[in-house]
């Protein structure tokens, strides 16, 4: 079986305050089964940005229809960007586990930084 890879193609994403940012993430395999989550930062203090499985994330939408059984695109859009949103965002695959899912593989991360102000 092909080993799952997490692809985040952009190392750096320049964004504009008030606009929508798109963070790209694709996987190369559907297996092992388990959810994909987005975090800002690393380590125990990382901030959950989006959980495919559950939760309410009013500023986040997915680019693709995650209910497709063959979906491999876990890209997200974050609306109404503010300076507080800057940081490095990681797309992380978990494999199912009991009682807790287990982190399986992380993307390399995309750094979100503020670009020029709109004229």
């Amino acid at each position: 079986e092909e080993e799952l890879q997490m692809i985040q193609p952009e190392k750096l994403l320049l964004v504009t305050v008030g606009k929508t940012a798109t963070l790209h993430c694709t996987v190369t395999s559907l297996l092992p089964v388990g959810p994909v989550l987005w975090f800002r930062g690393v380590g125990p203090g990382r901030e959950l940005i989006y959980n495919q499985k559950e939760g309410h994330f009013p500023r986040v939408t997915t680019v693709s229809d995650l209910t497709k059984r063959n979906n491999m695109d876990f890209s997200i859009r974050i609306s109404s960007i503010t300076p507080a949103d800057v940081g490095t965002y990681y797309c992380v695959k978990f494999r199912k586990g009991s009682p807790e899912n287990v982190e399986f593989k992380s993307g390399p991360g995309t750094e979100m930084a503020l670009g020029a102000k709109p004229s």
Epitope: L30, L31, Q52, T67, R69, K96, S98
Partner: antibody, heavy 118, light 107 residues
Amino acid sequence: DVQLVESGGGVVRPGESLRLSCAASGFTFSSHAMSWVRQAPGKGLEWLAGISAGGSDTYYIDSVKGRFTISRDNSKSSLYLRMNSLTAEDTAVYYCARETWNHLFDYWGLGTLVTVSS
Amino acid sequence: ALTQPASVSANPGETVKITCSGGDYYSTYYAWYQQKSPGSAPVTVIHSDDERPSDIPSRFSGSASGSAATLIITGVRVEDEAVYFCGGYDGRTYINTFGAGTTLTVL
């Protein structure tokens, strides 16, 4: 409360067609994949078909592929199953079910009975 | 195909375990569905191996390891008498399957 109500069942002759409907309420229908599952008299559950939230992707068990068609109308919060060339083996209670994020089922309708008999 | 025992029985208050085998842990998620009479609407008591819907009593729990899943009813009650179907979703084939059902009798 989540509610799924099937309709369209009845008695048909072998070779005929039928369209089942499932009216959904109590949740954002357009955000959930949906499926049809049936249960023949005295038998277990059998998954038939599933459809993605947007309706673009459909999935079938091999035994009904090409004969059954699953579809949905998100503007009406409705799910459908078109069944062609029915045989006695299609006699069953047909349930619609809402899918979880990982394509299991969390809510079920009450079912509608389809009887195929000459 | 998913395999489960045809029947189990228990006295009220006992712990019941129903096993379901045949799935691949790497690619399969399991669920458990309760049906109190033939042709009545199934009720999901466990999905995603071990997640219990909010309206299901805490005496129902689930687990999965290797190629098997287990439904556990701790302190079984007379009203738990039903047929329990295990179900699986296989991420490799995109197909849902069910076991044949286990009839739980509470003596």
